[in-house]
């Protein structure tokens, strides 16, 4: 399927947001660093099917969404800019649904793809623990924006590379 | 494939102005910091300081705060050194290196080729 | 600032030796300890970081090891493309620092 034009704007935008959430001097927080355990894996360029992969980029942005649309991310993070975040996240959603519906057939997810969307909600339960074990902190939420502007911008390649194999 | 270019080699008199740059490729600029090291002649590495080229954030080592200046463009993806005012001590090399920031990636795993800036008069 | 003790300061070696360079963190470090290789007139080079990490297209030869404040640098069988200068860093916090450096020479 086609991810319409605005899909890849919508990329962008939310990634400019994420920089925006900035709250901290992160040069503070290098004590904080911690190994999330990316599923790269799920991202890299394998025998990947057009519909596994847009399951798994469904998976990752609404994990995303889950995770700052807590009560702790709208206190430490800034509420207009949430708000525009989710407006962007929610775009996504939409759009990736409606590949999954041409490419499968059906919204959800199909249970060959398990493996690889238990591997992206792993890897949110690490980061979610670990915002947990480190109190919610401002290092804390430092060091998981960038975690999620780099995994964001995995996405961003994979469906770069999905939308150039047409 | 990533490079950091770095600026060719100066020769400067005390007292005289210098900015050395380094520019990134192959890579999100500004998804990196980039930071600046120190090696004098016959002796070891020193840190200088490190910049964030998205927002321009820089922190310093205490040996080199005040003495030099780092700053970045992201628009030409370049990061700079710079100098206001040379010291016959200031004879080194410098190499800039990036860093991964706050993610867990490896530290300082592509460097410039470094550019030798002598001071004498 | 975190000091960084690299032992022993110079060391002369055989090809085949394994080969053995300690460093040593004033305070706890946690794992965020990185190894570089750097040869006359060229930049440095990273080997291991986060204490033990092999980094992308580093012989396996080296292996790095430690936690806390005791780190070592390894490598099983010298070969002659070896002989340099390494050095140890510490990522734990600002300001960076690094060892003095380790010089591996021909015996």
């Known amino acids: 399927c086609d991810l319409p034009q605005t899909h890849s704007l919508g990329n962008r935008r939310a990634l400019i947001l994420l920089a925006q959430m900035r709250r901290i001097s992160p040069f503070s927080c290098l004590k904080d660093r911690h190994d999330f355990e990316f599923p790269q894996e799920e991202f890299d360029d394998k025998q990947f099917q057009k519909a596994q992969a847009i399951s798994v980029l469904h998976e990752m942005i609404q994990q995303t969404f889950n995770l700052f649309s807590t009560k702790d991310s709208s206190a430490a993070l800034d509420e207009t800019l949430l708000d525009e975040f989710y407006i962007e996240l929610d775009q996504q959603l939409n759009d990736l649904e409606s590949c999954v519906m041409q490419e499968v057939g059906v919204i959800e997810s199909p249970l060959m793809y398990e493996d690889s969307i238990l591997a992206v909600r792993k890897y949110f339960q690490r980061i979610t623990l670990y915002l947990t074990e480190k109190k919610y902190s401002s290092c804390a939420w430092e060091v998981v924006r960038a975690e999620i502007m780099r995994s964001f911008s995995l996405s961003i390649n994979l469906q770069k590379r999905l939308k150039s194999k047409e | 494939e990533v490079q950091l270019v770095q600026s060719g080699a100066e020769v400067k008199k005390p007292g005289e102005s210098l900015k050395i740059s380094c520019k990134g490729s192959?890579?999100?600029?500004?998804?990196?910091?980039i930071g600046w090291v120190r090696q004098m002649p016959g002796k070891g590495l020193e840190w200088m300081g490190i910049?964030?080229?998205?927002?321009?954030?820089?922190a310093y080592s205490p040996s080199f705060q005040g003495q030099v200046t780092i700053s970045a463009d992201k628009s030409i993806s370049t990061a700079y050194l710079q100098w206001s005012s040379l010291k016959a001590s200031d004879t080194a090399m410098y190499y800039c290196a990036r860093h991964p920031g706050l993610n867990w990636a490896p530290d300082f795993d592509y460097w410039g080729q470094g550019t030798l800036v002598t001071v004498s008069s | 600032d975190i000091q960084m003790t690299q032992s022993p300061s110079s060391l002369s070696a055989s090809v085949g030796d394994r080969v053995t360079i300690t460093c040593r963190a004033s305070?706890?470090?946690?794992?965020?300890l990185n190894w570089y290789q750097q040869k006359p007139g060229k930049a440095p080079k990273l080997l291991i970081y986060?204490?033990?990490s092999l980094q992308s297209g580093v012989p396996s030869r080296f292996s790095g090891s430690g936690s806390g404040t005791d780190f070592t640098l390894t490598i099983s069988s010298l070969q002659p493309e070896d002989f340099a200068t390494y050095y140890c860093?510490?990522?734990?916090?600002?300001?960076?620092?690094f060892g003095q450096g380790t010089k591996v020479e021909i015996k």
């Open positions: 860093q510490q990522s734990y916090d600002f300001p960076l620092t």
């Open positions: 986060f204490a033990s």
């Open positions: 910049i964030d080229p998205s927002d321009s954030d820089t």
């Open positions: 192959g890579y999100s600029f500004t998804s990196y910091w």
């Open positions: 305070q706890s470090i946690g794992k965020s």
